[in-house]
C-alpha cells in the first residue's frame, strides 16, 4: 500500500537535485580556485541535512547554518549588485563586469539558483512530486527560507556603494514583498553602507520617462533614508546598449546617457 503523501501547491523538487547541486559545486570550485578547499560532498550533506526528514513548512534559518558555515565566502563588500525581478540582466552584467557580484555569483547562490527542493517529515525521501508554495501553502518552506537566509547574509556583508537593478517594466518597480524589499533592504548595515544606488531598467525602446520618479522608487528612497543610508537612482533607458557599453566602455556612443 503506497504511503499517503502530502500534496503541496508548488512544483516538486527539481529532478536530479542532489546530482545538480554536486555538479554545480564541482564546477564552482573549479572556476574559483579560492574555493577549492570546499568539500562538495560535505556541502551536499549539509544542504540535505537542512530539509530532509523535516516538515517542509517548518524550516528555520537555523536548519541552514551548517551549510552557511561550509559556504562561507568573502566577496568584495563594495562590489555587490542586488536585483529584483530582473535576474537575467543582472547576471549578464556581472558576467561582463567580473569584479561585481550578485548573490548567484557566490557558491551558495550558484548551487541553488532556479532549483526547487523539499523533503517529508520523518522520512529520508526527497519529494519530487510537490513542494509548498510560498503563498498557497507556507512561507517557512525549504526554498524560501534558504533564499531569505543567504540574501540576509549577502546584504549584511555589503559596504560603501551598493547597487540594485530594478525592473522598470513592472507595475511595482520596487516591491516591498520581494526578497530585495523584504530582506535585503532591511539588512544593509548603515554603519558600513554609504549609498544604495538603484538602476531602473527600462523595457520599451521608446520609453523616455524618468522612472526614478515612480512612487515605488520614492517609497524605496524613504525606507533607505530612514535607515541613514543615502539613495541615488539612475534610469537605464537602453539595457542592450548598457551591456554593450560595459563590454566596450571606449565606444564613442557610450558617453551619452544610456
Amino acid at each position: 500500500v503506497p504511503r499517503w503523501r502530502q500534496q503541496w501547491s508548488g512544483p516538486g523538487t527539481t529532478k536530479r537535485f542532489p546530482e545538480t547541486v554536486l555538479a554545480r559545486c564541482v564546477k564552482y570550485t573549479e572556476i574559483h580556485p579560492e574555493m577549492r578547499h570546499v568539500d562538495c560532498q560535505s556541502v551536499w550533506d549539509a544542504f540535505k541535512g537542512a530539509f530532509i526528514s523535516k516538515h517542509p513548512c517548518n524550516i528555520t534559518e537555523e536548519d541552514y547554518q551548517p551549510l552557511m558555515k561550509l559556504g562561507t565566502q568573502t566577496v568584495p563588500c563594495n562590489k555587490i549588485l542586488l536585483w529584483s525581478r530582473i535576474k537575467d540582466l543582472a547576471h549578464q552584467f556581472t558576467q561582463v563586469q567580473r569584479d561585481m557580484f550578485t548573490l548567484e555569483d557566490t557558491l551558495l547562490g550558484y548551487l541553488a539558483d532556479d532549483l526547487t527542493w523539499c523533503g517529508e517529515f520523518n522520512t529520508s525521501k526527497i519529494n519530487y512530486q510537490s513542494c509548498p508554495d510560498w503563498r498557497k501553502d507556507c512561507s517557512n518552506n525549504p526554498v524560501s527560507v534558504f533564499w531569505k537566509t543567504v540574501s540576509r547574509r549577502f546584504a549584511e556583508a555589503a559596504c560603501d556603494v551598493v547597487h540594485v537593478m530594478l525592473n522598470g517594466s513592472r507595475s511595482k518597480i520596487f516591491d516591498k514583498n520581494s526578497t530585495f524589499g523584504s530582506v535585503e533592504v532591511h539588512n544593509l548595515q548603515p554603519e558600513k553602507v554609504q549609498t544604495l544606488e538603484a538602476w531602473v531598467i527600462h523595457g520599451g525602446r521608446e520609453d523616455s520617462r524618468d522612472l526614478c520618479q515612480d512612487p515605488t522608487i520614492k517609497e524605496l528612497e524613504s525606507i533607505i533614508s530612514k535607515r541613514n543610508i543615502q539613495f541615488s537612482c539612475k534610469n537605464i533607458y537602453r539595457p542592450d546598449k548598457f551591456l554593450q557599453c560595459v563590454k566596450n566602455p571606449e565606444d564613442s556612443s557610450c558617453t551619452s546617457e544610456i
Partner: antibody, heavy 125, light 113 residues
Framework: QVQLQESGPGLVKPSQTLSLTCTVS??????????WSWIRQHPGKGLEWIGY???????YYNPSLKSRVTISVDTSKNQFSLKLSSVTAADTAVYYC?????????????????WGKGTTVTVSS | DIVMTQSPDSLAVSLGERATINCKSS????????????LAWYQQKPGQPPKLLIY???TRESGVPDRFSGSGSGTDFTLTISSLQAEDVAVYYC?????????FGGGTKVEIK
Amino acid sequence: QVQLQESGPGLVKPSQTLSLTCTVSGGSISSGGYYWSWIRQHPGKGLEWIGYIYYSGSTYYNPSLKSRVTISVDTSKNQFSLKLSSVTAADTAVYYCARAKSELVLPYYYYMDVWGKGTTVTVSS
Amino acid sequence: DIVMTQSPDSLAVSLGERATINCKSSQSVLFSSNNKNYLAWYQQKPGQPPKLLIYWASTRESGVPDRFSGSGSGTDFTLTISSLQAEDVAVYYCQQYYSLPPTFGGGTKVEIK
C-alpha cells in the same frame, strides 16, 4: 589513446591502510570533462563503485565507504590515488581505476569509458 | 541508492543465436529534461577489466560490433546480442548513473550452449 594503470602493494595487513595509485598516460588528467574513479570487485562478485575525484580536487565517495576512503590527485604526475583505512578481509578485491565521462559546462558524472587492468589486493595477516 | 537487478544470472546460447539480458532499476533512470536514460552496459571477460559497450541505454560505444544493442526506458532495460560469437563469452553488467553513487547490476554470465 588514454590508458590507466593501477599500482600498489598486493598484500595489506588487517587494520592497516590500503594505498593504490592510478597513473594516466596518453592524456592529461587536468583536461576537464572527466571524473577519475575507483571501483572494486570482490572475488567472484559484482562491481562496487568507491568514489571519484575531479582534477580540481573535488571528491565524492560512496556513502557506504565514506568514513574510510580518501581519494587525492596529483596533476603534476598525472596520477590519482586511493587510500582505504582500517581494512579487513572484506576489503580483499580487485581494485580498478577508471575514467568517467562528464560534461565541461556542468560536470555531471556519467559512464566509465576507460578502465585500468586492475590490481588484486589481499587483506591478510 | 538505486538497486539494479539483472536477469538471468547466467545464460547459455548457441553460436549464432540471440542472447537477451534484462536489467531492472528500483527507480526510473529516465531524465525527463533531456529524455535520456542514464544507463550503461559493460562486458567483462575473465581476467580483464569491464569494457563499456552501451551508454544512454542504446548508444553503442565506438568500436563495439553492431550485434550488440541496448533498449528500454525508465526502469526496464535489455541488452541484446543478435548473433552470439565465441568472443562474446563474458559477464555483462548494467550500471545506472542517474544518481550518486553509481550502482551496478549483479551481472549475467553468457556462455555457449
